[in-house]
Interface confidence: low
Amino acid sequence: SAPGEDEECGRVRDFVAKLANNTHQHVFDDLRGSVSLSWVGDSTGVILVLTTFHVPLVIMTFGQSKLYRSEDYGKNFKDITDLINNTFIRTEFGMAIGPENSGKVVLTAEVSGGSRGGRIFRSSDFAKNFVQTDLPFHPLTQMMYSPQNSDYLLALSTENGLWVSKNFGGKWEEIHKAVCLAKWGSDNTIFFTTYANGSCKADLGALELWRTSDLGKSFKTIGVKIYSFGLGGRFLFASVMADKDTTRRIHVSTDQGDTWSMAQLPSVGQEQFYSILAANDDMVFMHVDEPGDTGFGTIFTSDDRGIVYSKSLDRHLYTTTGGETDFTNVTSLRGVYITSVLSEDNSIQTMITFDQGGRWTHLRKPENSECDATAKNKNECSLHIHASYSISQKLNVPMAPLSEPNAVGIVIAHGSVGDAISVMVPDVYISDDGGYSWTKMLEGPHYYTILDSGGIIVAIEHSSRPINVIKFSTDEGQCWQTYTFTRDPIYFTGLASEPGARSMNISIWGFTESFLTSQWVSYTIDFKDILERNCEEKDYTIWLAHSTDPEDYEDGCILGYKEQFLRLRKSSVCQNGRDYVVTKQPSICLCSLEDFLCDFGYYRPENDSKCVEQPELKGHDLEFCLYGREEHLTTNGYRKIPGDKCQGGVNPVREVKDLKKKCTSNFLSPEKQNSKSN
């Protein structure tokens, strides 16, 4: 029988009446157009909704937008368009919401052609009030808040000027001209690239990388011959043109650009690209594109300095610069990532790593599924996950994989079961152990979301027809109840729940269509009465993450330690609550060779935990570039995995000697870097 339809499924008592009392409809007095929704702050209940409608006239497009505000998680909305003087808001800039619980919001208005600059509306009280401010420039990008101080904003102008505000957009100052890209770093630092000659495009590969740590009072040039730059975790990366040809290399800095080291990664040509797939304070996943229009490349993982890299995964699917990759961080379990590879036969397969890129494997076939036509052997196959690439190919996949840090172990994704990803209509699968095992959760494509830290999963069928039914599960997707939330079906456009998965409210968005008009409508359902009581100690059970062999003393050891979590029992129907904190108990493991990556010049043969010297480097001195000096590496082939906490056990020796020689790096060495003040 289909999931959720067998006899073992207990029904939630009287749920129809409970949900009916907690279902709130809001019909927006709007023609359909487009709608965008933003949550303002965390646990505030404040939602802003911007609807826009374009009327194409003979010579121009006339636009109209409305702004609505809710302070009860979407149950009721108030039209606050008058607070922004009924101005048409530019949706391409979205609503710029301030970090944390600052309560700050910036909306960018559409202005008439001849105006001197743009116009913004600013709020610092969770959109209760707005102040209109005329800008001395036309913005090219959305206002960017400093992560450290929400009063500090930066924006690029259509004239490529870098503008900064120190008082939340009240007053603006142009701190630099000819700027291509600008980003906030830590401690209110701004990094940006500048061009000298024609334009950003013309000077690509000849840009300069600048830094200001005092909002534009003084500057330091920290790099030349720059193609692009990026920030990830505590690392600053720059791709730099080589002197002699059109290739470029990655350089990395961990001190805000004062000193640089050349990353031990392959150089790339004009048509290739680098991409930071994921980064934290410990390490980086870097994709290096293969030459030619192959659509794939190689994933490398870094050491703790971002300099020495190990090959992690070959034939990694990544179509073009800024194109599609399925790389997904499974946030519900430490060390887990999922992505796709392009196999030799041109089919796409899903791979998963549980140890931060150390080893990759196929996803285990779900117990309750059979292999499809892509499988050569009908009894042996794997689960393959649909992510960004499938969505870009317009497959019947409404959502990417979903996981939440506070819903420990839960991963939900569309997939197919075979030897490769299938274009047939996918089903929805769930894992409750971070991707080790999977179960078919729902037949056919669905939208899905996690509420109450995993206590409730909500789903809506993906259909071209109007819908009026929502499905929910209180036992991590084993059993499903259906609730008809309206008599009149709506054309569904999206599910919205507060980011962080702590809420018990879900908003169903869509539009109604009648002969004469169509209107936006939302239904907000509060599940608080379904989970009648607060969870108690007896509702939780101890779960060892990454457990694959309970007999083994080292069972659950990943990156040098194991973690036991308190997890809600599937049979418990209770509220984790908004203040729920994941309870975990870590314990350190003994070191084994699995806790070490292969050092520069070494590699791991398949199915072997030992690192052996690369044949082409045998007998050579291992020398590499570090902080602009050449270093000599004495190693027996191992280095500790970044973030690995193991102690004792195996302890390979590693020593680095300074060769006291300058590297022939293309980068500015620190002593050549210049500073200037405004």
Epitope: T319, N346, A373, Y389, A420, V423
Partner: antibody, heavy 129, light 107 residues
Framework: QVQLVQSGAEVKKPGASVKVSCKAS????????MSWVRQAPGQGLEWMGI????????SYAQRFQGRVTMTRDTSTSTVYMELSSLRSEDTAVYYC??????????????????????WGQGTTVTVSS | EIVMTQSPATLSVSPGERATLSCRAS??????LAWYQQKPGQAPRLLIY???TRATGIPARFSGSGSGTEFTLTISSLQSEDFAVYYC?????????FGGGTKVEIK
């Protein structure tokens, strides 16, 4: 085992319609497209169209557009092909064939094709006045 | 639509010899190509898919190669049961189209 069983031979007059059935067994019916292919006496194979058993969506070859209708009944795992306004040149053996139809999403820039891996025994349709 | 052209129309080969059949597409079909074998009075049987992968249960003497517009089916050592008509078929763009077929007969 996996098999497709088609309905029996038909003799029709010009202008009439014929409906051929194809019953699938031994696999999950909703996981595979079904193609229809015909073969006139002494001629080669000609693809007519394809039906997706889940939604029932179809794609027909241009030359059959307007005359052919492909449907499915998931409760009986059966696919049907109806051809109307028959003429003598429609005399042929009609085959249904399980078609993973590019079931392996290939990347990038093309699909991966698995071929029509299971065929029905064929249904002979004779159009004669 | 994509036109598939097979050559030769007829191939006379002695048992035990090698047979090479060609299929050309009017535009690139990438590797979205299949080969079928059909014997008189029977339904076609899938031999090769994805241009080069043997279908389940197909003997190793059958091999497919090519990509884009030029494809080849090779039967390394003809057995008596291999004398039949062979069709190529593309599935790059709808409508799927077949080649006219190559008849492999006993010399």
């Amino acid at each position: 085992q996996v098999q497709l069983v088609q309905s029996g031979a038909e003799v029709k007059k010009p202008g009439a319609s014929v409906k051929v059935s194809c019953k699938a067994s031994g696999y999950t019916f909703t996981k595979y497209y079904m193609s229809w292919v015909r073969q006139a006496p002494g001629q080669g194979l000609e693809w007519m169209g394809i039906v997706n058993p889940i939604g029932g969506s179809t794609s027909y070859a241009q030359r059959f557009q307007g005359r052919v209708t492909m449907t499915r009944d998931t409760s009986t795992s059966t696919v049907y092909m109806e051809l109307s306004s028959l003429r003598s040149e429609d005399t042929a053996v009609y085959y249904c064939a399980r078609d993973p139809s590019g079931i392996g999403l290939a990347g990038p820039f093309s699909r991966y094709y698995y071929g029509m891996d299971v065929w029905g025994q064929g249904t002979t349709v004779t159009v004669s006045s | 639509e994509i036109v598939m052209t097979q050559s030769p129309a007829t191939l006379s080969v002695s048992p035990g010899e090698r047979a090479t059949l060609s299929c050309r597409a009017s535009q690139s079909v990438s590797s979205n190509l299949a080969w079928y074998q059909q014997k008189p009075g029977q339904a076609p049987r899938l031999l090769i898919y994805g241009a080069s992968t043997r279908a389940t249960g197909i003997p190793a003497r059958f091999s497919g190669s090519g990509s884009g517009t030029e494809f080849t089916l090779t039967i390394s050592s003809l057995q008596s049961e291999d004398f039949a008509v062979y069709y190529c078929q593309q599935a790059r763009l709808g409508p799927w189209t077949f080649g006219g077929g190559t008849k492999v007969e006993i010399k």
